[in-house]
């Protein structure tokens, strides 16, 4: 299931890059799969929000919880906030299977 998520993520990133006109030399943060969830490409100064992966949101449909953010800075992506373990209750797929 997670290999499938990763493959879908890479497809999404490719499509987003085309839509946004992103390439390897573009300023900003490239889209990425961080082994837990998918992050779309972003411009410097942009904050991106993602929900905890669906698998772990079954018991937590709350809009206010289970959300992780990263800032796109001149140095690249910031660390996720909150950390996955605190926001979602887990921090690695491998360990959950």
């Amino acid at each position: 299931i997670f290999k499938k998520e990763q493959a879908m993520c890479l497809e999404k990133i490719q499509r987003a890059n085309e839509l946004m006109g992103f390439n390897d030399s573009s300023p900003g943060c490239p889209g990425m799969w961080d082994n837990i969830t998918c992050w779309k490409p972003a411009h410097v100064g942009e904050m991106v929000l993602v929900s905890c992966p669906e698998l772990f949101r079954i018991f937590n449909p709350d809009q206010d919880m289970g959300v992780v953010s990263r800032n796109c800075t001149e140095d690249g992506w910031s660390e996720p906030f909150p950390h996955y373990f605190d926001a979602c209750g887990f921090d690695e797929y491998e360990s959950e299977t």
Epitope: F59, D62, M65, G66, F81, D86, G89, D91, E92, S95
Partner: antibody, heavy 123, light 107 residues
């Protein structure tokens, strides 16, 4: 029913190592849904979360920055217990120390606690 | 670290009263907020998690509310066994930090 039983010395000399153990009954230290935490409480600092260990296919630890250079939390799967070691203690480390189980349901919370151990750091 | 403050620091009340304790976080913490009760010489006891979820076995006279930075713990019809100290704790960011406590004593 989950119970946590703490043991360890109540008096430690400055610069030495504080060592406490928390024995788990009614659960396992290897439970993939739980975390195993140490917290302390003193009049000057209130309740202070020190860190945790947990198993998710491999053992992991999270420590509070305030004690990160001095703390070790180790699981002992053979005895289903976990321990706290705090090195280079000073009188500031005098507190009641608690172990507690962490569980997840929308957020992490501490649902079962040990009885507490008053540790005094004094020569 | 996220700072947690509580008010009042202490309050006097009578059996049957409805009381409210406030907890404030130094930054937004969504609903990653837990409440504990502690009696002298005992370990804290979990009351409420995720700001408003009542822990199993806790009487329904306890309730929690709030989101973001401001939270409240309400006890409806205070019982003799409710005289204790109450702590809030955030769990959105390590180190998890606690409020200084609110002591509820008998008027």
């Amino acid at each position: 029913q989950v119970q946590l039983q703490q043991s360890g010395p109540g008096l430690v000399k400055p610069s030495q190592t504080l060592s406490l153990t928390c024995a788990i009954s009614g659960d396992s230290v290897s439970n993939k849904q739980a975390t195993w935490n140490w917290i302390r409480q003193s009049p000057s600092r209130g309740l202070e979360w020190l860190g945790r260990t947990y198993y998710r296919g491999k053992w992991k630890n999270h420590y509070a920055v305030s004690v990160k250079s001095r703390i070790t939390i180790n699981p002992d799967t053979s005895k289903s217990q976990f321990s706290l070691q705090l090195n280079s203690v000073t009188p500031e480390d005098t507190a009641v120390y608690y172990c507690a189980r962490g569980m997840w349901n929308q957020n992490w919370f501490l649902d079962h606690w040990g009885q507490g151990t008053l540790v005094t750091v004094s020569s | 670290d996220i700072q947690m403050t509580q008010s009042p620091s202490s309050l006097s009340a009578s059996v049957g009263d409805r009381i409210t304790i406030t907890c404030r976080a130094s930054q937004k913490i969504a609903r990653y907020l837990v409440w504990y009760q502690q009696k002298p010489g005992k370990a804290p006891k979990l009351l409420i998690y995720a700001a408003n979820m009542l822990q199993s076995g806790i009487p329904s006279r306890f309730s929690g509310s709030g989101s973001g930075t401001d939270f409240t713990l309400t006890i409806n019809s205070l019982q003799p066994e409710d005289f204790a100290t109450y702590f809030c704790q955030q769990s959105i960011q390590q180190p998890y930090t606690f409020g200084p406590g609110t002591k509820v004593d008998i008027k």
